[in-house]
Structure formats: structure tokens, C-alpha cells
Amino acid sequence: DAHKSEVAHRFKDLGEENFKALVLIAFAQYLQQCPFEDHVKLVNEVTEFAKTCVADESAENCDKSLHTLFGDKLCTVATLRETYGEMADCCAKQEPERNECFLQHKDDNPNLPRLVRPEVDVMCTAFHDNEETFLKKYLYEIARRHPYFYAPELLFFAKRYKAAFTECCQAADKAACLLPKLDELRDEGKASSAKQRLKCASLQKFGERAFKAWAVARLSQRFPKAEFAEVSKLVTDLTKVHTECCHGDLLECADDRADLAKYICENQDSISSKLKECCEKPLLEKSHCIAEVENDEMPADLPSLAADFVESKDVCKNYAEAKDVFLGMFLYEYARRHPDYSVVLLLRLAKTYETTLEKCCAAADPHECYAKVFDEFKPLVEEPQNLIKQNCELFEQLGEYKFQNALLVRYTKKVPQVSTPTLVEVSRNLGKVGSKCCKHPEAKRMPCAEDYLSVVLNQLCVLHEKTPVSDRVTKCCTESLVNRRPCFSALEVDETYVPKEFNAETFTFHADICTLSEKERQIKKQTALVELVKHKPKATKEQLKAVMDDFAAFVEKCCKADDKETCFAEEGKKLVAASQAALGL
């Protein structure tokens, strides 16, 4: 499978359009501050070079690795040191260290302006004037803000983005057609980015074994009729795809993902009965569809797990012969029987089983020692079940906004050192679990909720890693991937925290709040709530709720006033003074 020229091989496999798009994504994910025009220039140079290699694979430099070619190209950027500081030192290194260096400098929270959506007519004009540039700009803006976005999936988003403009810019009411589609793409895009970020964190922080365990559990739930060998093959291939994408090898990743989709569709009879529709779609839609496909029905008469994994006299022998294979089989068998469990719960059960075998297979009477291992699973299963039940009840009682506020208070008290924007973003996302998952029946609630919470808590972990401020966050994030959520759930109020000094500026508001969207206004109020808790961590829920109601009354009053700015200035001072007096700020 060795090719004389890797770049020619990928260009031919992917085609010029996808090749150029993927190189643009790769470059934008590495050099997140570079202007669009600079990236386009670099991409065009790489593409022209690739074409010379397609014409003659023996041409000069065509035998170089993609990392060497792309790294050399990135290192030609003139302003590297001024713009990126120490990242410029990467260019002094040789491959593969240079690429590793670039990867380490990817910024999950780059200092980039918020993307402001222009008027619909302005967007449609730009789309019609230069469709290619318009779509490239979309790829560039998403990729630089989401440096771990799953590149082949971003191509699928770009295809949908193009389709939305093609359809809606001809519609009678362009805005009514286009805006809901763009909102949907934005929300799905954020979710997709966060899910992929967890996959990359899993691989990079916990290693291939952790990712493979996750993949065995998820694919076994999704394809319960597939044999273990088939699931193992899919896991191996999927691990390769995600390792490549997370490592910046986007061309190889996209190529291998296409091969995997092809393999799955050619072998769907031995994988899942739910793949038929997916496999009739074009490549990008097909891959997306497979990744989202619903769980197949469980085979009718699966035997009890106890026979092979508890009662058999060969348990320790089978375990000793091939530990990871045996544990993989346990995970496969348990997961295919439990689509109602979250993946992280299944992994906790497998870890408990592994720990028990490690201990018991060295004991005098192994069977006697591990005979009750399944009893140890009960509390592990009940903990997330109870937590989800309680939180769904709270969500149904409060609604999403107030549920988010309850979580904001809860998490600010747990980890008050974390920055306010991070606490607001993470708590808002945690709160979305309610509308996302609580509507589901019992059998679907846990996989929906706990696996979603894993994705959101990973956002907290990667943002915190950039500027660590809390030992408790570091501990929960690094000790165990599958126990992150229980670790955060178990945190109580941080009694060591010294309340933040009061700063009136933090609680100063202006008339611009009146023209904000409902979402932006909520974020302003939630930011104030976090700051309030940081100043007064001992305030009761009732006091915080009452102060927030005062804040709402203040905003409502001033937004109705003739002289809004004066009202905000004068009444704002009164609000702060009143809250100080009442809470002793």
C-alpha cells in the first residue's frame, strides 16, 4: 500500500475539490490567527504542487511525507513569530516532532471575534458573486474556531451550507427560508465539534486503549447483531480514522473514513439491518448517516452473561490468555444487551470486572472470589439512574433557563476559581441536557444524558487545561475518563475558596442589554449570577433567586424608561447598594 508520492495518492483518491477543502481546514486548524487570503494562497500552492506530483510521482519533493510538505508550507508564513509567539519555535524541529509541536499549540478558545451573521441579502449577494470563496470562507471560519472539528464531517456541513444558500437565495422570503437552516447548522456544528473534541481528548490524554473501549461499547450497542470479530474490525478501522483526524492527518482521515463507509455498506448484512437507507446516499451524507444510525434490534434469545463471565471454570484461563480480547468480549456482550446504558456506565462496569479478575485470578479460590462480581454493578447502575431522575424532575419543574441557573450556582460553588465565561458556557450546555434528554422514555434517557454530559464536561476540561486554576477540576479531568461525571457530581461546595472582592464594574449594565436577543440577555444575567456566587458563595439559593429577580425588575424598568442610559446608571447603583446591604457583599 506504499505509494511513491503520498500527496499524489491522496489527491487522486479525494479529488481536487475535497483535497483543497481539507488542506484549507488543516491549515486553518493549525494557524488559527492567519487571514483567510493567506491560507487560500498556501492552499493553492500546495494544490499546484500536488498536481505536478500526480503528473509525475518521481518529481522533486513528491516523495516527502504530508507532514513534511504541509509543515514546510506553514513555516513559510512571514508573521509566524509576531502572531503566534513560541509556536514559531516548532519550525526549528524536524518531523514528527514539528507536527506534534503544532498540535500542542492548537487553541480550543482562540481570541477571535464572534461570528456576526450579516443581513440575508448581503449573504446572498456574496454567495452569488463568488460561490467558491464564500464556501471556503465558511470552512476557514469554522475550522479556525474549532481546531479539532472532524474534517470529513465539516465537508458535509459545507455541502448543507451551500444547499441552504442555493435554495433560499431564490426564495420569495429569503430570510424565512435561510435563517432556520443556518441556526440548525450552527447548533449541530457546535454539537459535532464538542463530540469530536471528546474523541480527540480520549485518544490524546488516555490513549488508544481508552478510545477502543469506548468504540467497542458504542458499536456493540449500535450493531448488536454483528459478531465480535466484525465489531473488532470496525473498532480498529474507526480508531485509525479518528487518530488521523485528531493528529492533523486530514487527508488520510477523510480517505480512510470513505473506505470504512464503503466497507460497512458492502457488509451491512453482517453488521446491521438499519444501514440500508444510509448506504444509498452520496459519500458525505452516507458517512454522516452511518455515524448517526439508530441502534439495531437486539437478537432475540441472547443467553445470560453469567455463563461465560462468572460461572465458567475457564474465566481466569480465558482472561490470562488474552486479557484485552476477553475484556473486549465482555464489553461487547454487555453493551449489545444494554442499549439503555450510557457508554461510560458500560465502561465503568467493564473496569470493575477487570479489577475483580485481576484480584481474584490471583486468589486461592478464584471462582469463589469473583462469583458475586455482578452484584457490584448494581450501585454503579443506580447512581446515574437516580441522578437523571432527580435532574429531569428539576428540569420539568423549572424549565431550561432556570434549570441552567440552578446548575450555574451548583458548579460555581463546586469550582469557583474557574473563569466566569467558562462556567456560564459549560453550565448552559449542561442545562441543555434537560430539553435534549428528559423527553425520552426511560430506556433512552441514560445513554442520551450521561454521554452528552461527558461531552460537555470535556469542554470544561479542555478549556481549564489551557489556564489551570482549580486542582479539583484537574483531578476530575485527569484521573479517569469514564468517572469524570461522577467525580464532578460528588464535588461539594469548595470551603477553601476565598470570596472574590466586590467590583462594582462587574455589576454595571448599560442600555445595550435592551436590544440583545433573548439568549444574549440570558447570558448577561447568568454572568451576573456567577459573579454574585463568587462574591457570596454562602448565599442561599433563595437569596440568589431573589437578587436575580431584582436584577430582572431593574432591567425591565430601565428598558422601558425614556432615558435608558441614565436609568441604568442611577438604578444600577441602587441595585448594587441594595444587594450589598442585603447580602453583605
Epitope: 432556570k402 430582572a552 425588575a553 441594595a578
Partner: nanobody
Framework: QVQLVESGGGLVQAGDSLRLSCAAS????????MGWFRQAPGKEREFVAR????????YYADSVKGRFTGSRDNAKNTVYLQMNSLKPEDTAVYYC?????????????????WGQGTQVTVSS
């Protein structure tokens, strides 16, 4: 269940003063803002004043600003409305209400529990 009982209404001359009281029982009084509203015959119920949970912040309708003062005594579970320089147009049934968990602070729909009202009549 929350109970609110207003008192202190009556018939007065223009320019006189009255002090309305509202005694509350039920859920924790100090956790919620309280509102005073009024309703004149044939008119909608209108906002008069909002007294916050701690009594440290009060908002008024423009029509009563400078003449009416709201206050509360959380130890006594009571909220007050001191009305000075009364005018004939202040004639109405005055209600006290306890804030709900959502909705506008200046609209009756944002308040959950209501008293039965006390009549205030200002003659010229």
C-alpha cells in the same frame, strides 16, 4: 398555601395620607418580592409598587412616585404602602401580591398569590 390579608383602607380627603398593611402567612416571606397593585372601577388592574425581598429596593409607577413609599418588615411578615398627598384618581381597590417564579415584575401575571384587596376612596 400563602395567605395575604390587606388592611388600612378607608375614605379620606384629597391631600390626606393612609398606610396600608399586608400580612402574609405560608411560604417563606423573605424569599420573595412583594407588589402593590390597584384596580379602579371599569379599569385594568395596574402596578403601583414593587418591594424587593429584603426591603432595600423599591420601584414605583410614575403616577405615584414621590408620594407613595413601600416598605416591609420580614420579622413580622408584613409589607406596607405609605400613601401621602392622595388624589381622587388614587381611588381604587388596593391589592398586595407575592411574586411568582417568572413573568414581568410590573404585570399582575408575574405575581402568584393575592390578597382580597382593601378599598381606598379619596374624595375631593
Amino acid at each position: 398555601q400563602v395567605q395575604l390579608v390587606e388592611s388600612g383602607g378607608g375614605l379620606v380627603q384629597a391631600g390626606d395620607s393612609l398606610r396600608l398593611s399586608c400580612a402574609a402567612s405560608g411560604r417563606t416571606f423573605s424569599d420573595y418580592a412583594m407588589g402593590w397593585f390597584r384596580q379602579a372601577p371599569g379599569k385594568e388592574r395596574e402596578f403601583v409598587a414593587r418591594i424587593n425581598w429584603s426591603g432595600t429596593l423599591t420601584y414605583y409607577a410614575d403616577s405615584v412616585k414621590g408620594r407613595f413609599t413601600g416598605s416591609r418588615d420580614n420579622a413580622k411578615n408584613t409589607v406596607y404602602l405609605q400613601m401621602n398627598s392622595l388624589k381622587p384618581e388614587d381611588t381604587a381597590v388596593y391589592y398586595c401580591a407575592q411574586r411568582g417564579d417568572s413573568g414581568s415584575n410590573y404585570d399582575p401575571s408575574g405575581y402568584r398569590y393575592w390578597g382580597q384587596g382593601t378599598q381606598v376612596t379619596v374624595s375631593s
